[in-house]
């Protein structure tokens, strides 16, 4: 009797179990009672990444420099091109279809994690004892200056945006 289900890497058509085309190849003709499935390799700018019965290969992704994209990994007949962003930019989505500039951490915030081609800058508030007085995509929160180690005293307290101001110790005592 004709099969109702087929083995792995096969598909059912016209009561026949036909072999799927291997990754990197597209379907030209289904198998028959007397012939095998016929497949053809994808062209240079195309790919198929699974065992398939597709009659057309997929176009490789284009890494558009106008969108800040560049090729991270060139596609093959079995894999798509992987795009990443140019220096100073990161992807707007997992599929990396466009890029935006890295975020800068405002004064009072420091860089917790520097941005990559696929992830934005992660900022964190400067905790007590640390500050950042610049807007930067690289700078971490810096510790307040320790006046004591310089044999100085705090003349003006630090904030999350400013360092302490040290001054000489007052030698006149009551």
């Amino acid at each position: 009797e004709p099969p109702t289900a087929c083995r792995e890497k096969q598909y059912l058509i016209n009561s026949q179990c036909c072999s799927l085309c291997q990754p990197g190849q597209k379907l030209v003709s289904d198998c028959t009672e007397f012939t095998e499935t016929e497949c053809l390799p994808c062209s240079e700018s195309e790919f198929l990444d699974t065992w398939n019965r597709e009659t057309r290969c997929h176009q490789h992704k284009y890494c558009d420099p106008n969108l800040g994209l560049q090729v991270q990994q060139k596609g093959t007949s079995e894999t798509d091109t992987i795009c990443t962003c140019e220096e100073g930019l990161h992807c707007t989505s997992e599929s990396c279809e466009s890029c935006v500039p890295h975020r800068s951490c405002l004064p009072g915030f420091g860089v917790k994690q520097i941005a990559t081609g696929v992830s934005d800058t992660i900022c964190e508030p400067c905790p007590v004892g640390f500050f950042s007085n610049v807007s930067s995509a690289f700078e971490k929160c810096r510790p307040w200056t320790s006046c004591e180690t310089k044999d100085l005293v705090v003349q003006q307290a630090g904030t999350n945006k400013t360092d302490v101001v040290c001054g000489p110790q007052d030698r006149q005592r009551a």
Epitope: S19, V28, S29, D30, T32, E33, F34, T35, E36
Partner: antibody, heavy 112, light 112 residues
């Protein structure tokens, strides 16, 4: 239902060219399958002569050397056999077939 | 070429009794995908061959289940579990794994 029907002269003179046509109904010859010519000399077994594929490419039996040509007319859904330089040994019933469906066969006699 | 040898060349069977025909190939008919393209045909007197079995063991549509095919590699068998009067004719195996396609020489089945 797929149907095949052979047509052509029943008598061919020695050294001339045998020409037969197979008309297919119920299925397009460009869709899939290999479209074959098979012959059977009187009182003998079956001999595969060659095929034309759905894409128009061919394969022939080497025993027929360079005498055989199979072509097609997709507008009429027909494929044809030409066998040149025939001799009495080419007298046979000629079948066109998709291998699951066959024509009823046409008898060709080679005689002067 | 794959030479196909059928045995016996003729057999006479009482209705209701089983029959078995062997077909042996000079080379393996299994292709690189592990598929084997061997067909069995019955040619009744004065008719075109009709497909019984394809791919070794698959019955073609409308073929009674008393016909079964088996085998692998180079050795294949057609079995008729209970022969009926309408089964008379010549049985042929045909391999379509390798070009040129080749038929066995035929086995004539008669009713006792």
């Amino acid at each position: 239902e797929v149907q095949l029907q052979e047509s052509g002269p029943g008598l061919v003179k020695p050294s001339e060219t045998l020409s037969l046509t197979c008309t297919v109904s119920g299925y397009s010859i460009t869709s899939n399958y290999y479209w074959n010519w098979i012959r059977q000399p009187p009182g003998k077994g079956l001999e595969w002569m060659g095929y034309i594929r759905y894409d128009g490419s061919n394969n022939y039996n080497p025993s027929l050397k360079n005498r055989i040509t199979i072509s097609r007319d997709t507008s009429k859904n027909q494929f044809s056999l030409k066998l040149s330089s025939v001799t009495a040994a080419d007298t046979a019933v000629y079948y066109c077939a998709r291998l699951d469906y066959w024509g009823q066969g046409t008898t060709v006699t080679v005689s002067s | 070429d794959a030479v196909m040898t059928q045995t016996p060349l003729s057999l006479s069977v009482t209705p209701g009794q089983p029959a078995s025909i062997s077909c042996r190939s000079s080379q393996s008919l299994e292709n690189t995908n592990g598929n084997t393209f061997l067909n069995w045909y019955l040619q009744k007197p004065g008719q075109s061959p009709q497909l019984l079995i394809y791919r070794v063991s698959n019955r073609f549509s409308g073929v009674p289940d008393r016909f079964s095919g088996s085998g692998s590699g180079t050795d294949f068998t057609l079995k008729i579990s209970r022969v009926e009067a309408e089964d008379v004719g010549v049985y042929y195996c045909l391999q379509v794994t390798h070009v040129p396609f080749t038929f066995g020489q035929g086995t004539k089945l008669e009713i006792k």
